[in-house]
């Protein structure tokens, strides 16, 4: 079957996100991928969205992330916009209202996004073949 347009948007947004480093991409998030053996695909998407929402809710106006220069501030705003777009599209793919995120493991946001990108590219290659 054809790949969902949302999936293409997610990969595109992840490509943009992983290209840019900001003051906040080294901050840690819950690593939902560390032990996701018994998790459905929809649950994974839902939990990834939950992690992203937690991150931008906490750090949107975080002075550590805003930086001291206009360029740092601008980059941080762009990061938040991309994370919100990603969150929105992941919720759309998941089709679930809520999901628990209880893992103790942590990873940097940067690594989390790279892992998510790998998963999404794998999904895309399956649905486009």
């Amino acid at each position: 079957h054809k790949c969902d347009i949302t999936l293409q948007e997610i990969i595109k947004t992840l490509n943009s996100l992983t290209e840019q480093k900001t003051l906040c991409t080294e901050l840690t998030v819950t690593d939902i991928f560390a032990a996701s053996k018994n998790t459905t695909e929809k649950e994974t998407f839902c939990r990834a969205a939950t992690v992203l929402r937690q991150f931008y809710s906490h750090h949107e106006k975080d002075t550590r992330c805003l930086g001291a220069t206009a360029q740092q501030f601008h980059r941080h705003k762009q990061l938040i916009r991309f994370l919100k777009r990603l969150d929105r599209n992941l919720w759309g793919l998941a089709g679930l209202n809520s999901c628990p995120v209880k893992e103790a493991n942590q990873s940097t946001l940067e690594n989390f996004l790279e892992r998510l990108k790998t998963i999404m590219r794998e999904k895309y290659s399956k649905c486009s073949s």
Partner: antibody, heavy 120, light 107 residues
Framework: QVQLVESGGGMVQPGRSLRLSCAAS????????MHWVRQAPGKGLEWVTV????????YYADSVKGRFTISRDNSKNTLYLQMNSLRAEDTAVYYC?????????????WGQGTMVTVSS | AIQLTQSPSSLSASVGDRVTITCRAS??????LAWYQQKPGKAPKLLIY???SLESGVPSRFSGSGSGTDFTLTISSLQPEDFATYYC?????????FGQGTRLEIK
């Protein structure tokens, strides 16, 4: 300061074409998604189209799909709307708008609008 | 497309009044809702985004709440400059849609 200025509006006959421009200043166009929103006389707001920051993704309202094309020239900091096969119901004030600083697909900066009248 | 229904379509109020405008979505849109104010002959102005976040420079008498399908815009104490038309907008998915507007008039 941050500003959007539309141009290119006017009166045109049904079936003809028109190209609107939106010049951005005070920010880098290539960092933001950009939209066109229109408002028919005495009516509410209608979203028309969006182009992503890098120009690679565009979406359109069903009412203009196949007739309107959004594009951007980031080197000129300018957004465009090519309108073909115009109809009377396309008569409206056309606004270009920038996506929000903190959220995608909302509009935090608007132009002053340019009037498009489609009439024979 | 997601439909947004605002109520009331118009209302009359006095300076100092507390006013609430509601916006209902035809399906769940999480918190992907914004509110705008528009005065005659002018472009709209963003007031609230993400359902409840106040846009920079907007007076604190404006507030937004809600999630899912039901949202409200509240003006805690109307000022003379607040008489205008208000629109809600969803950005949960394309096509982006607006409510039909609520016209706020002086009583």
């Amino acid at each position: 300061q941050v500003q959007l200025v539309e141009s290119g509006g006017g009166m045109v006959q049904p079936g003809r074409s028109l190209r609107l421009s939106c010049a951005a200043s005070g920010f880098t166009l290539s960092s933001y998604g950009m939209h066109w929103v229109r408002q028919a006389p005495g009516k509410g707001l209608e979203w028309v189209t969006v182009i992503w920051y890098d120009g690679n993704n565009q979406y359109y309202a069903d009412s203009v799909k196949g007739r309107f094309t959004i594009s951007r020239d980031n080197s000129k900091n300018t957004l465009y709307l090519q309108m073909n096969s115009l109809r009377a119901e396309d008569t409206a004030v056309y606004y270009c708008a920038r996506e929000g600083s903190w959220s995608p697909d909302i509009f935090d900066i608007w132009g002053q609008g340019t009037m498009v009248t489609v009439s024979s | 497309a997601i439909q947004l229904t605002q109520s009331p379509s118009s209302l009359s109020a006095s300076v100092g009044d507390r006013v609430t405008i509601t916006c209902r979505a035809s399906q769940g849109i999480s918190s992907y809702l914004a509110w705008y104010q528009q005065k005659p002959g002018k472009a709209p102005k963003l007031l609230i985004y993400d359902a409840s976040s106040l846009e920079s420079g907007v007076p604190s008498r404006f507030s937004g709440s809600g999630s899912g399908t039901d949202f409200t815009l509240t003006i805690s104490s109307l000022q003379p400059e607040d008489f205008a038309t208000y629109y809600c907008q969803q950005f949960n998915s394309y096509p982006i849609t607006f409510g039909q507007g609520t016209r706020l008039e002086i009583k």
